[in-house]
């Protein structure tokens, strides 16, 4: 059980106050983290509170400003990047968001040696992506879907690609579906370790159907946003990978990297690229039916000026029970011999663990094992491997950092974080300097987040980087809800849940219950993290009990739970929420006449299906930006879990799992449907179809749209949204305003 101290003592009770909705909307109780921008084994950059860029040397204890806030302000810079030779800094301004990761910006190059901006051969604007080479100060950037190279910041650019076209050909940047569902980055180019080569992806979207929606703006006529967006079963982007020698790029030109034959025989995806050395690269490919992944190691042949990917260096990863990998196929972390690597994949018992691959996947040596999962490999050095897992005390929603000594035999394992601040910190991530000489630990909770700096050899804490003292003080007079993380055992399924309880919770009383659900494949909602958010307010001020439940399909508890939803989305996720609610009712403190459910995105889909389950458990519920039919969602994501919407594959379940098919069942619940009209991700179409089905079934419901808002419903829409949802729930639960 994780109990958040409510800090309520009788003597203090008068000075304590509940959270208000205003607190949440103003971000009054938001926390800070500190991630060093490492530039060597012992140095990092950090942007100070007054916006100076400061270089810190851990070993000398010295720090100095490398770039003043005056310089930053002169171009309204919101971000920066130091060249590896430390001669130049790029300054980023005019940030303009595109999709989840992508944005365009204006870039200025500042010469640190003379304290002036580089004049002549300035960069064009707006740029879609820009990065330094890993050594020296070469620049690669993407402008109007083409890639350019500068040997030095003041040099004229060399154009590497010429076929880039808006919404047609993307070079060095992903198209919509690769950005959102495969790469999870704004870029699709990768420098080799010493900057000799530049690899990049070309995405051809010429044949992809286009989603079009109105953007109302302020003009007399709305404009139409067009995005090549492959929905389930539609034509996909065609991807090619090229590598160019950046020393004399005009000589040989870009060289295409061959696709493994077993992949190229049908539709496929490129999933990631990892440089091993300057002359060895590792590419990962995935069949469109995403249960077969191939990792291909390619070598540069100087005499041929080509990239050779021998079949003997192809490693196949296949899933027989679900899809390949977790949310994504894991990426390899190469060891110092530049051919063997460490990788997370399912072991024979169906738990994701670290394996060491020297020759073939079949001969892989398992490094970690147990009924828990390795989650991320942070760093491999000559003698240590650092990773995170949820092994400690068998809580799947925790993350601790471990070190395995790979230099000694047998390898020994040490938990670096388990006992550091045990009550406060149970969910960590880490950031390592070169050669893991030092590292930062960022603890996200369950207590107030704290970031600390550590010695990579001894694991000794060197200093606190950020401890959120202001937040701690601000919370001293706040009645925070209590939180507990527990599990239910139902029909051989373990359902972990987090319950958020009002500050003066009394088990003998009855409380309204709100289920917050996401429930998407390979997600996890029950995590030991700190948050003061909308549901904290609902518990603190409005006296609701809020519960989050991780059911079948969720992550980090083994393949049996994860792959249970394979090819049948919308069934077990909903069943498990309902099962949990019944168990909560049995606990005796839930008013069974006042139970609601809400979710966003995938959670909106699950909440809609739960409301339409016909159980009579839910009085009301909210779906924000829900998927309503898997035929409307992106191919890469949907087909991973559902296969294809074709007669000979899985069309029947695509049809059976829609929200619209259950329109009649909404008759006895209060339903609030919410969507942004400019949602590029889960298209407004989804809610439009739900609304149409409900109207056709003559079922009353409430709805709210947010004009020109995307999937995030940000800015003023956020305030309106949470205010609106609060009113809806209070009305549903008969709570006075």
């Amino acid at each position: 059980i994780v109990l958040r101290p409510s800090r309520v003592h009788n003597s203090e009770e008068n000075t304590m106050r509940a959270l208000t909705l205003k607190d949440i909307l103003n971000g009054t109780f938001s926390y800070k983290t500190f991630f060093p921008n490492w530039i060597s084994g012992q140095e990092y950059l950090h942007q100070s509170a007054d916006n100076n860029i400061v270089l810190y040397n851990i070993e000398t204890g010295q720090s100095y400003t490398i770039l003043s806030n005056r310089t930053m302000k002169s171009v309204n810079a919101s971000n920066y990047g130091l060249s590896p030779d430390r001669q130049f800094v790029y300054l980023e301004s005019d940030y303009s968001k595109l999709w989840r990761y992508s944005y365009t910006a204006t870039y200025y190059i500042y010469d640190l040696s003379n304290g002036e901006f580089v004049r002549g051969n300035e960069l064009p604007r707006p740029i879609q992506y820009l990065c330094w080479s890993p050594v020296g100060s070469k620049l690669a950037y993407v402008y109007q879907n083409n890639i350019y190279l500068k040997q030095r910041p003041g040099d004229p650019p060399f154009q590497i690609t010429f076929n880039g076209r808006e919404n047609k050909i993307f070079n060095g940047i992903p198209d919509w579906v690769y950005e959102e569902e495969m790469l999870a980055t704004k870029y699709a180019l990768w420098w080799s370790p010493n900057g000799k080569f530049l690899a990049y992806a070309e995405f051809n979207d010429t044949d992809i159907p286009v989603i079009a929606y109105s953007y109302y703006g302020d003009e007399q006529y709305p404009r139409t946003i067009n995005i090549p967006y492959p929905k389930a079963g539609a034509k996909n982007p065609v991807v090619r990978i090229f590598i160019i020698d950046t020393t004399y790029p005009a000589y040989v030109g870009p060289q295409e990297v061959p696709v493994p034959a077993m992949i190229a025989s049908s539709d496929y995806y490129f999933s990631w690229l990892t440089w091993v050395t300057d002359e060895r690269v590792c590419l990962q490919w995935l069949k469109r039916v995403q249960n077969v992944s191939v990792l291909s190691i390619c070598d540069f042949r100087e005499d041929w000026q080509t990239w050779d990917c021998p079949k003997t260096q192809e490693h196949i990863e296949e899933s027989r029970t679900g899809w390949a990998g977790g949310f994504f196929v894991s990426t390899p972390v190469f060891s110092y011999d530049a051919i063997s690597y460490y990788k997370i994949f399912s072991d024979k018992d169906g738990y994701k663990h670290i394996h060491y691959i020297k020759d073939t996947v079949e001969n892989a040596i398992q490094i970690t094992s147990g009924k828990w999962e390795a989650i991320n490999i942070f760093r491999v050095t000559q003698d240590s491997l650092f990773y995170s897992s949820n092994e400690f005390e068998e809580y799947p929603g925790r993350r601790n950092i471990y070190r395995i000594s790979i230099g000694s035999y047998p390898p020994s394992k040490k938990c670096v974080t388990c006992h550091l601040r045990k009550e406060r910190c149970q969910y960590y991530t880490a950031s390592f300097s070169d050669y893991a000489k030092y590292y930062a630990l960022v603890c996200y909770g369950p207590g107030i987040p704290i970031s600390t700096l550590h010695d990579g050899r001894t694991d000794q804490e060197i200093k606190i980087l950020e401890e959120n003292k202001e937040l701690e003080n601000a919370l001293k007079n706040i009645q925070l809800p209590k939180e507990e993380i527990k599990k239910l055992e139902v029909d051989e399924i373990t359902l972990w849940y987090k319950m958020i309880l009002p500050p003066q919770f009394d088990r003998s009383k009855k409380y309204p219950l709100l289920i917050q659900v996401y429930g998407g494949p390979c997600s996890q909602s029950v995590r030991s993290v700190f948050a003061v958010n909308w549901i904290s307010y609902l518990a603190s001020k409005e006296g609701m009990v809020i519960a989050l439940v991780d059911g079948r399909g969720t992550a980090f508890q083994g393949d049996k739970l994860l792959y249970a939803v394979y090819r049948k989305l919308g069934v077990y996720e909903v069943e498990d929420q309902i099962t949990a609610v019944r168990k909560f009712i049995e606990m005796g403190f839930i008013d069974e006449k006042r139970i609601a459910i809400w979710g966003w995105s995938y959670g909106g889909y699950v909440s809609s299906l739960a409301l339409a389950s016909g159980t009579g458990l839910f009085k009301c519920g909210i779906a924000v930006a829900p998927v309503s039919s898997w035929e409307y969602y992106a191919s890469v994501y949907t087909e991973r879990f559902m296969g294809l919407p074709t007669k000979d594959d899985n069309l029947e379940h695509y049809k059976n799992s829609t929200v619209m098919a259950r329109a009649e069942y909404f008759r006895n619940v209060d339903y609030l449907l919410i969507h942004g009209t400019a949602d590029d991700n889960v298209h407004f179409q989804n809610s439009a179809q739900i609304a149409k089905a409900l109207v056709n079934a003559q079922v009353d419901f409430q709805a709210m749209w947010y004009s020109d808002q995307n999937h995030g419903l940000s800015g003023l829409s956020t305030n309106h949204l949470y205010t609106h949802m609060t009113h809806f729930l209070k009305q549903c639960f008969s709570l006075s305003d």
Epitope: R152, P156, A250, P254, Q255, E256, W304, T306
Partner: antibody, heavy 117, light 108 residues
């Protein structure tokens, strides 16, 4: 030893067509971008066209765009230049050269194309 | 397109003398993309220098290249009889790649 051997030149009337070939040997042909460069009698060098190693990308000088087509057959180690709608100003020695935009490290001996009525 | 202007048009020198050939670009060219070629009558051009200063395979060390930005130079330290020819500079910075009009080095 790298060798490039052009053929297919000759006399052609304005508006006519000609197809030049360049047989390559001594290197992994499919790995390299290749170019055509021409030289009008008594004049300097002018880049005409280039093609990537796989043949997937082609590039042309404005003066020949829409009239000339560069292609390659990697199984035959041969580079081609299909020239249509020929004009008097296309009269030149045509060289095939190894390289994309430069440097061009190996050149053929050239083949003369004369456009005249 | 980038225009390359070579000077002088003709250079009359004796064997053993030093030859300095200039190539000026209408806009900045990164040194990685500047090359020099030699062409003798009735022959194909031959690559001498690439990357503004790197000698191609088999090129004697009396040939050297230098320069950056818009001004580049080819130097032949001691002219040999076989060096009398036409020399072209070439840029690959922008499409289309362009050549200078050439400098003829002739025997004085």
């Amino acid at each position: 030893e790298v060798q490039l051997l052009e053929s297919g030149g000759g006399l052609v009337q304005p508006g006519g067509s000609l197809r030049l070939s360049c047989a390559a040997s001594g290197f992994t042909f499919s790995s390299y971008a290749m170019s055509w460069v021409r030289q009008a009698p008594g004049k300097g060098l002018e880049w005409v066209s280039a093609i990537s190693g796989s043949g997937g990308s082609t590039y042309y000088a404005d003066s020949v765009k829409g009239r000339f087509t560069i292609s390659r057959d990697n199984s035959k180690n041969t580079l081609y230049l299909q020239m249509n709608s020929l004009r008097a100003e296309d009269t030149a020695v045509y060289y095939c050269a190894k390289g994309w935009l430069g440097p061009f490290d190996y050149w053929g001996q050239g083949t003369l194309v004369t456009v005249s009525s | 397109e980038i225009v390359l202007t070579q000077s002088p048009g003709t250079l009359s020198l004796s064997p053993g003398e030093r030859a300095t050939l200039s190539c000026r670009a209408s806009q900045s060219v990164s040194s990685s993309y500047l090359a020099w070629y030699q062409q003798k009558p009735g022959q194909a051009p031959r690559l001498l220098i690439y990357g503004a200063s790197s000698r191609a395979t088999g090129i004697p060390d009396r040939f050297s290249g230098s320069g950056s930005g818009t001004d580049f130079t080819l130097t032949i330290s001691r002219l040999e009889p076989e060096d009398f020819a036409v020399y072209y500079c070439q840029q690959g910075q922008l499409i289309p790649p362009t050549f200078g009009q050439g400098t003829k080095v002739e025997i004085k």
